[in-house]
């Protein structure tokens, strides 16, 4: 359920507020609907960077749970093959605040277009 993914993103934003994590993360800020699965996989990969950089058990657990929920939701859509989409490394690097904002936006796209 994508709303549960949103809920975990809110938890992560709450948890990182008191931390100073200056990592930059590959961020897709203008997702074409035909590349949303590819973009989501990039977001999930980059999310693990936040988990590692924070060194915080609560963030680690929430990230782990979010990835499971998102992958379950993606697999329920069936095996979607997308072509012509950007590789993760081709995306713009942004700070954590902007990354999470764009992450919420893409999850909302999955909800809105389902």
């Amino acid at each position: 359920n994508w709303v549960n993914v949103i809920s975990d993103l809110k938890k992560i934003e709450d948890l990182i507020q008191s931390m100073h994590i200056d990592a930059t993360l590959y961020t897709e800020s203008d997702v074409h609907p035909s590349c949303k699965v590819t973009a989501m996989k990039c977001f999930l990969l980059e999310l693990q960077v936040i988990s590692l950089e924070s060194g915080d058990a609560s963030i680690h657990d929430t990230v782990e749970n979010l990835i499971i929920l998102a992958n379950n939701s993606l697999s329920s859509n069936g095996n979607v093959t997308e072509s012509g989409c950007k590789e993760c490394e081709e995306l713009e690097e942004k700070n954590i605040k902007e990354f999470l904002q764009s992450f919420v936006h893409i999850v909302q796209m999955f909800i809105n277009t389902s």
Epitope: W2, V3, I6, S7, Q101, V104, H105, I111, N112, T113
Partner: antibody
Framework: QVQLQESGPGLVKPSGTLSLTCAVS?????????WSWVRQPPGKGLEWIGE???????NYNPSLKSRVTISVDKSKNQFSLKLSSVTAADTAVYYC????????????WGQGTLVTVSS | SSELTQDPAASVALGQTVRITCQGD??????ASWYQQKPGQAPILVIY???NRPSGIPDRFSGSSSGNTASLTITGAQAEDEADYYC???????????FGGGTKLTVL
């Protein structure tokens, strides 16, 4: 600076169709944002009507879904609202608004246009 | 009925602090945003996300969230803060946007 401007008839007859257009300037309707219509009956609160993404995806308030159509015209940088089978209860100020990126919000609003349903 | 509940009215003495709340189970998943609306005018976004202010919004406005409640706090209320305040978020499905019923703030 993004600006939104609603236009359309200020008076609609009962059982008729309310039609409004929102012209977007200072930004592109083909941005990553979703675009919404919100209304406010006189002396009452705000009610979300529905939203559209420039690829044509739409979502509507369940209580209005059977009567609402929102469409987008990328060539004119505008989006439109049609509300059918109107009654006096649909009399309201109608606003168009741009949704922010990420968490729910409306970061830009039109000035609003009053639509009265009366014979 | 709205999925977001606000007290219909609140008041604050000039220069004092007031907190306006918004309740709803959907706020466990989503942050709320807050709008100020003065008579005859369109709403203005004052707080969005965790606690973000759009440019031009005074820093006396702040937002917070705990459990199923979102709060808008005005620290050192001014006469020009007298207005209706609305919260906004998404519903349980995540597909639909919803507003609270609004709180009319009077500055005494």
């Amino acid at each position: 600076q993004v600006q939104l401007q609603e236009s359309g008839p200020g008076l609609v007859k009962p059982s008729g169709t309310l039609s409004l257009t929102c012209a977007v300037s200072g930004g592109s309707i083909s941005s990553s944002n979703w675009w919404s219509w919100v209304r406010q009956p006189p002396g009452k609160g705000l009610e979300w009507i529905g939203e559209i993404y420039h690829y044509g995806y739409t979502n509507y308030n369940p209580s209005l879904k059977s009567r609402v159509t929102i469409s987008v015209d990328k060539s004119k940088n505008q989006f439109s609202l049609k509300l059918s089978s109107v009654t006096a209860a649909d009399t309201a100020v109608y606003y168009c608004a741009r949704e922010g990126i990420g968490w729910p919000s409306f970061d830009y609003w039109g000035q609003g246009t009053l639509v009265t349903v009366s014979s | 009925s709205s999925e977001l509940t606000q007290d219909p009215a609140a008041s604050v003495a000039l220069g004092q602090t007031v907190r306006i709340t918004c309740q709803g189970d959907t706020l466990r998943s989503y942050y709320a945003s807050w709008y100020q609306q003065k008579p005859g005018q369109a709403p203005i976004l004052v707080i969005y996300g965790k606690n973000n202010r759009p440019s031009g919004i005074p820093d006396r406005f702040s937002g917070s969230s705990s459990g199923n409640t979102a709060s808008l706090t005005i620290t050192g209320a001014q006469a020009e803060d007298e207005a209706d305040y609305y919260c906004n978020s998404r519903d349980f499905s995540g597909k639909n946007l919803v507003f609270g019923g609004g709180t009319k703030l009077t500055v005494l």
